[in-house]
Interface confidence: medium
C-alpha cells in the first residue's frame, strides 16, 4: 500500500525536484565533458607561453565540474527513484548523500573565503598569460577569445603591469569596441576588476551558496518526512 494524502504530495514534489536536479547534473556533466574534450577550450585550459602553464585552478576546475555533474546526477537519481519507488533504503541513502554534500558545501565555502586572494591571483595570472599568448602568437584565437571574454565580462582593458608592446596590441585590437581605450587602459584595470569581483561581489556568491544550502535542507526534510510516511504506511 502506497503513501496517501500530504505524504503523496511530498513524494511527487520530491520526484519533480530531483528530476530537475538530475537534469541539471546531466547538463553540467555534458558541458564539462565537452569542455574537457573540445580542442578550442582544451587549448584555453592548457594555455602555455614558453614553459609557463596556465594555473592549476582552471585545469582542476573542469574536473570539479565533471565531479559535481556526476554527483548531482547520482543524487538526483536516488531522490527520483527513491521517491517514486517509495524505497526507504534509497531515500536513506539520498538523505546521507545530502548531508555529505551539505558538509562539502560548507567546507568549500569556508575554503573559498579563506583562499579568495589566491583564487583572484590565479585568475589574474590566467588573464596575463592569455594576453601574452594573444600578442606573441596572434594565431592563438583561443587566447584572444579568453582576453576578449575578460574584457567584455568585466568591462575592463589591460592592466597596470602591461608592456608597451602589449598596450599597442590592446589599443588596436583587443579592447572592447566603442570604449575610450586610452582611459580604459589605465582606469579600467582588469586586475583591479578581478580583485573587486572577489571582494566586492563576494556577497553574490554567498547568496547563491545560501540558496543552495536552503534547497538542500528543504530536500533533507522532505526525504525524512517521506521516509517516515513510508514506514508508517507499511505498518498498517
Amino acid at each position: 500500500m502506497g503513501v496517501e494524502g500530504c505524504t503523496k504530495c511530498i513524494k511527487y514534489l520530491l520526484f519533480v525536484f530531483n528530476f530537475i536536479f538530475w537534469l541539471a547534473g546531466g547538463i553540467i556533466l555534458g558541458v564539462a565533458l565537452w569542455l574537457r574534450h573540445d580542442s578550442q577550450t582544451t587549448n584555453i585550459l592548457y594555455l602555455q607561453l614558453g614553459d609557463k602553464q596556465a594555473p592549476n585552478t582552471f585545469y582542476v576546475g573542469i574536473y570539479i565540474l565533471i565531479a559535481v555533474g556526476a554527483v548531482m546526477m547520482f543524487v538526483g537519481f536516488l531522490g527520483c527513484y527513491g521517491a517514486i519507488q517509495e524505497s526507504q533504503c534509497l531515500l536513506g541513502t539520498f538523505f546521507t548523500c545530502l548531508v555529505i554534500l551539505f558538509a562539502c558545501e560548507v567546507a568549500a565555502g569556508i575554503w573559498g573565503f579563506v583562499n579568495k586572494d589566491q583564487i583572484a591571483k590565479d585568475v589574474k595570472q590566467f588573464y596575463d598569460q592569455a594576453l601574452q599568448q594573444a600578442v606573441v602568437d596572434d594565431d592563438a584565437n583561443n587566447a584572444k577569445a579568453v582576453v576578449k571574454t575578460f574584457h567584455e565580462t568585466l568591462d575592463c582593458c589591460g592592466s597596470s603591469t602591461l608592456t608597451a608592446l602589449t598596450t599597442s596590441v590592446l589599443k588596436n585590437n583587443l579592447c572592447p569596441s566603442g570604449s575610450n581605450i586610452i582611459s580604459n587602459l589605465f582606469k579600467e584595470d582588469c586586475h583591479q576588476k578581478i580583485d573587486d569581483l572577489f571582494s566586492g561581489k563576494l556577497y553574490l556568491i554567498g547568496i547563491a551558496a545560501i540558496v543552495v544550502a536552503v534547497i538542500m535542507i528543504f530536500e533533507m526534510i522532505l526525504s525524512m518526512v517521506l521516509c517516515c510516511g513510508i514506514r508508517n504506511s507499511s505498518v498498517y
Epitope: 614558453g50 600578442v135 596572434d138 594565431d139 608592456t163 608592446l165 598596450t167 589599443k171 585590437n173
Partner: antibody, heavy 123, light 110 residues
C-alpha cells in the same frame, strides 16, 4: 644559419611603386614578429613597419602610413613591403629584421637583420 | 627629430672605457626596456644589448647596458679599434612603436 635576404630594390620615379621581398632561412618566419627599417645613406635608422606572426597586428610609421603595406607569406617564409606613391625622401637602404619578444611580452629588439636593399626615388 | 636623444659623437683611446647615453621621456624610455645596436661601416646593424642590460650570445662582455629613470647608457670597456662604429638606442613605445635614437658615431683615437 639564421639569415634574412632582401630583394626588389632599385631606381624608381616619384609616384611609382616597388615591392620589396625578404626571404628567411634557418628559422620559421611564422613564429616571429617582423619589421622593416630604413636608413638614408649617411643618416640614422628609421623604423618603417612591423607585422605580427600571423598578420593580425600591423603597425606603420606616420611617414609611410597609407602608402606602404607590409605583408607576409609564412608558407614561403617571406616578408614583403609594398611601396606606393614613392617620394624622393623614401630613398634609403631598406632592411628587414626579426623582432625578439621576451617573457611578459617585452620587446627585446631586432635580433636578426638582412644585408639591406637600396631604393632610389629619383626622376 | 628623434624622441630619443644621443650625443652625435663620442671618442676614446684603445683600452679606455667609453659611455654613450640615450635620454628620453617617461612615456618611452621611462616605462620600457631599451635595446642597443652596433652598426659597423658598410654593414647592417647588429643587436648589441637587449632588455636594458642583456647581451645576445656572441657579444663580448666588454659591452654593458644600464638604465636609470629616463636615461639609458651603453658602456664599452677596454676599447678596441674594431669598436669604431655607429651606436643606436631603441625602444618600443606604445604610441609611436619602434623608436630609434639619432645614433652616436664612436671614434677610436690613435
Amino acid at each position: 644559419e639564421v639569415q634574412l635576404l632582401e630583394s626588389g630594390g632599385g631606381l624608381v620615379q616619384p609616384g611609382g611603386s616597388l615591392r620589396l621581398s625578404c626571404a628567411a632561412s634557418g628559422f620559421t618566419l611564422g613564429s616571429y614578429w617582423m619589421s622593416w627599417v630604413r636608413q638614408v645613406p649617411g643618416k640614422g635608422l628609421e623604423w618603417v613597419s612591423s607585422i605580427s606572426s600571423s598578420s593580425s597586428y600591423i603597425y606603420y610609421a606616420d611617414s609611410v602610413k597609407g602608402r606602404f603595406t607590409i605583408s607576409r607569406d609564412n608558407s614561403k617564409n617571406t616578408l614583403y613591403l609594398q611601396m606606393n606613391s614613392l617620394r624622393a625622401e623614401d630613398t634609403a637602404v631598406y632592411y628587414c629584421a626579426r623582432q625578439r619578444i621576451g617573457d611578459l611580452v617585452v620587446h627585446y629588439g631586432l635580433d636578426v637583420w638582412g644585408q639591406g636593399t637600396l631604393v632610389t626615388v629619383s626622376s | 627629430q628623434s624622441v630619443l636623444t644621443q650625443p652625435p659623437s663620442a671618442s676614446g683611446t684603445p683600452g679606455q672605457r667609453v659611455t654613450i647615453s640615450c635620454s628620453g621621456s617617461s612615456s618611452n624610455l621611462g616605462s620600457n626596456t631599451v635595446n642597443w645596436y652596433q652598426q659597423l661601416p658598410g654593414t647592417a646593424p647588429k643587436l648589441l644589448i637587449y632588455g636594458n642590460s642583456n647581451r645576445p650570445s656572441g657579444v663580448p662582455d666588454r659591452f654593458s647596458g644600464s638604465k636609470s629613470g629616463t636615461t639609458a647608457s651603453l658602456a664599452i670597456s677596454g676599447l678596441r679599434s674594431e669598436d669604431e662604429a655607429d651606436y643606436y638606442c631603441e625602444v618600443w613605445d606604445s604610441d609611436s612603436y619602434v623608436t630609434f635614437g639619432g645614433g652616436t658615431k664612436l671614434t677610436v683615437l690613435g
